[in-house]
């Protein structure tokens, strides 16, 4: 089996208030089966940004069609950026578990920061 890797190519993403930010994440394997989630921050207080299996995330859309059975692109777009959105975003692979899924591997993170407004 190829070992799964989580790839977040940008260490830093400069964004503009009011615009849409794209956070990239790809995986190198579909296995083990389980969902990919996005969080801002780390540890017990991290904020869930997107969960592919459930929930309502009105400002978040996926770049790819996650219903494709061979999908390896879990990149997301966050619309209407505000200063409150700054932080480091992690895509995290979970493997299935009972009763709860188990965190399997995290990407290295992408720091979202505000760039200068265009003049």
């Amino acid at each position: 089996e190829e070992e799964l890797q989580m790839i977040q190519p940008e260490k830093l993403l400069l964004v503009t208030v009011g615009k849409t930010a794209t956070l990239h994440c790809t995986v190198t394997s579909l296995l083990p089966v389980g969902p990919v989630l996005w969080f801002r921050g780390v540890g017990p207080g991290r904020e869930l940004i997107y969960n592919q299996k459930e929930g309502h995330f009105p400002r978040v859309t996926t770049v790819s069609d996650l219903t494709k059975r061979n999908n390896m692109d879990f990149s997301i777009r966050i619309s209407s950026i505000t200063p409150a959105d700054v932080g480091t975003y992690y895509c995290v692979k979970f493997r299935k578990g009972s009763p709860e899924n188990v965190e399997f591997k995290s990407g290295p993170g992408t720091e979202m920061a505000l760039g200068a407004k265009p003049s």
Epitope: E1, K53, T67
Partner: antibody, heavy 118, light 107 residues
Framework: DVQLVESGGAVVRPGESLRLSCAAS????????MSWVRQAPGKGLEWLAG????????YYIDSVKGRFTISRDNSENSLYLQMNSLTAEDTAVYYC???????????WGLGTLVTVSS | ALTQPASVSANPGETVKITCSGG??????YGWYQQKSPGSAPVTVI????KRPSDIPSRFSGSASGSAATLTITGVRVEDEAVYYC???????????FGAGTTLTVL
């Protein structure tokens, strides 16, 4: 309420073609992958084909690959199964089913009966 | 191929377990589907190994471990008499597979 209603079942002769339809309502059809499952008389359930939400990716069981084509029209909230070169072994009730995020099924239609007989 | 017993029987109020083996835990999710008569629409009782739809009674539960999944009906009722099919989705092959079905008889 999620509703899936199949239609198009009929009695056909071996070698003929048939197109089944599944009308979906009560959910955002364009956000869900869909599948076709059949049940031959006195037999169990058999998954046939699946299609991604956008319709670009399709998946088939080997026994129908090349003969059956799954497709969808998201503007019409409809799923289709084009069946060619039918044989008596294709006689079955055909169900459409909505897929969960991990490609199992949560909602099913009532089914439509296809009979292939000379 | 997924393997499940052809039949099980129980008295009302008893606990019934139906097993489904043959999948690979690393690559397979399981679901369970109830069919009360041949040709009638199946009803999903469990998906994603252990997730129960909101309209399914809490006496139905699912679990998966190793290469097998289990459907448990705690306090079985006469109305639970049906054929129960397990299904697997294999993330290696992108294919869905059904077991042959288990006929539950409530005595």
């Amino acid at each position: 309420d999620v509703q899936l209603v199949e239609s198009g079942g009929a009695v056909v002769r071996p070698g003929e073609s048939l197109r089944l339809s599944c009308a979906a309502s009560g959910f955002t059809f364009s956000s869900y992958a869909m599948s076709w499952v059949r049940q031959a008389p006195g037999k169990g359930l058999e998954w046939l084909a699946g299609i991604s939400a956008g319709g670009s990716d399709t998946y088939y069981i080997d026994s129908v690959k090349g003969r059956f084509t799954i497709s969808r029209d998201n503007s019409e909230n409809s799923l289709y199964l084009q069946m060619n070169s039918l044989t008596a072994e294709d006689t079955a009730v055909y169900y459409c089913a909505r897929e969960t995020w991990n490609h199992l099924f949560d909602y099913w239609g009532l089914g439509t009966l296809v009979t292939v007989s000379s | 191929a997924l393997t499940q017993p052809a039949s099980v029987s129980a008295n009302p109020g008893e606990t019934v377990k139906i097993t489904c083996s043959g999948g690979d835990w690393y690559s397979t999710y399981y679901g369970w589907y109830q069919q009360k008569s041949p040709g009638s629409a199946p009803v999903t009782v469990i998906h994603s190994d252990d997730k129960r739809p909101s309209d399914i009674p809490s006496r139905f539960s699912g679990s998966a471990s190793g290469s097998a999944a289990t459907l448990t009906i705690t306090g079985v009722r006469v109305e639970d008499e049906a054929v129960y099919y397990c299904a697997g989705y294999d993330g290696r092959t992108y294919i869905n597979t059904f077991g042959a079905g288990t006929t539950l008889t409530v005595l």
